[in-house]
């Protein structure tokens, strides 16, 4: 698994470098997670043809994966820093159950899947420090998450491969949108 941000050899070898600002640290953390997702997607796409055929193989996707919408204030038109930050944090908290599902779904990238999960937890902490309105952030219900996890894990192999592909694709899109929005803050 890649080394988490702030622990690579370059950082150790350059003590004179200015410490990262909060925004830079968040930016770096997201890019680190995106690299991890790329590695996981590579394994998923090599293992099955889900990546090409997912559209025509599905009639409906009821996974309720977090997605950015106009009302969330994260797009250039109608940008709203506070609303957007709440959406990013809420979305990441909602993704956590899906990231838990991804554990044990990978053979050669098991550590990578764990790194993505742990780095996302760290990212949430960074963002929560940045947010002023923590009361507006709704935490997912643990009981609902537990039953969703059980349901996803009970699916057959084909559906589990499809679920894995959809989670990775959605999480990548969500993080890319978050990264663009956070760079405006």
């Amino acid at each position: 698994a890649p080394v988490p941000p702030g622990e690579d050899s370059k950082d150790v070898a350059a003590p004179h470098r200015q410490p990262l600002t909060s925004s830079e640290r968040i930016d770096k953390q997201i890019r680190y997670i995106l690299d991890g997702i790329s590695a996981l997607r590579k394994e998923t796409c090599n293992k099955s043809n889900m990546c090409e055929s997912s559209k025509e193989a599905l009639a409906e996707n009821n996974l309720n994966l977090p997605k950015m919408a106009e009302k969330d204030g994260c797009f250039q038109s109608g940008f709203n820093e506070e609303t957007c930050l709440v959406k990013i944090i809420t979305g990441l908290l909602e993704f956590e159950v899906y990231l838990e599902y991804l554990q044990n779904r990978f053979e050669s990238s098991e550590e990578q899947a764990r790194a993505v999960q742990m780095s996302t937890k760290v990212l949430i902490q960074f963002l929560q420090k940045k947010a002023k309105n923590l009361d507006a952030i709704t935490t997912p219900d643990p009981t609902t998450n537990a039953s969703l996890l059980t349901k996803l894990q009970a699916q057959n192999q084909w559906l589990q491969d499809m679920t894995t592909h959809l989670i990775l694709r959605s999480f990548k899109e969500f993080l890319q949108s978050s990264l663009r929005a956070l760079r405006q803050m």
Epitope: E56, A57, L58, A59, E60, L152, Q155, N156, L159, M162
Partner: nanobody, 124 residues
Framework: AVQLVDSGGGLVQAGDSLRLSCAAS????????MAWFRQAPGKEREFVAV????????YYADSVKGRFTISRDNAKNTVYLQMNSLKPEDTAVYYC?????????????????WGQGTQVTVSS
């Protein structure tokens, strides 16, 4: 587990209608997305139609759109396929399938439970 028994097949003329039924055992029938697939001799099993859990949404293969209608009666644990304006190319063994998943597939591997199949033959 769910057991599916499909019925209603037969030999009909082109342009005729037929209604297939699929009876399911199991108390949680309404949790399952129900689909119909068909398989003609020497061909792969192909998607025909699917209806979502509560029956709110339906999806069809392009080849049957406007001619076939899928419906379900959760009180009777049964799903139906009304087939109108039948064509010789609709000749196949029709299978009913079920899955309890947030994903509703149009691929046979997305289904866990299958009926035994009912033969539909359309003569010209």
């Amino acid at each position: 587990a769910v057991q599916l028994v499909d019925s209603g097949g037969g030999l009909v003329q082109a342009g005729d209608s037929l209604r297939l039924s699929c009876a399911a055992s199991g108390r949680t029938f309404s949790n399952y997305a129900m689909a119909w697939f068909r398989q003609a001799p020497g061909k792969e099993r192909e998607f025909v139609a699917v209806i979502s859990y509560a029956g709110g949404r339906t999806y069809y293969a392009d080849s049957v759109k406007g001619r076939f209608t899928i419906s379900r009666d959760n009180a009777k644990n049964t799903v139906y396929l009304q087939m109108n304006s039948l064509k010789p190319e609709d000749t196949a063994v029709y299978y009913c399938a079920a899955v309890d998943s947030p994903l509703i597939a149009t691929h046979p591997r997305g289904y866990d439970y299958w009926g035994q199949g009912t033969q539909v033959t359309v003569s010209s």
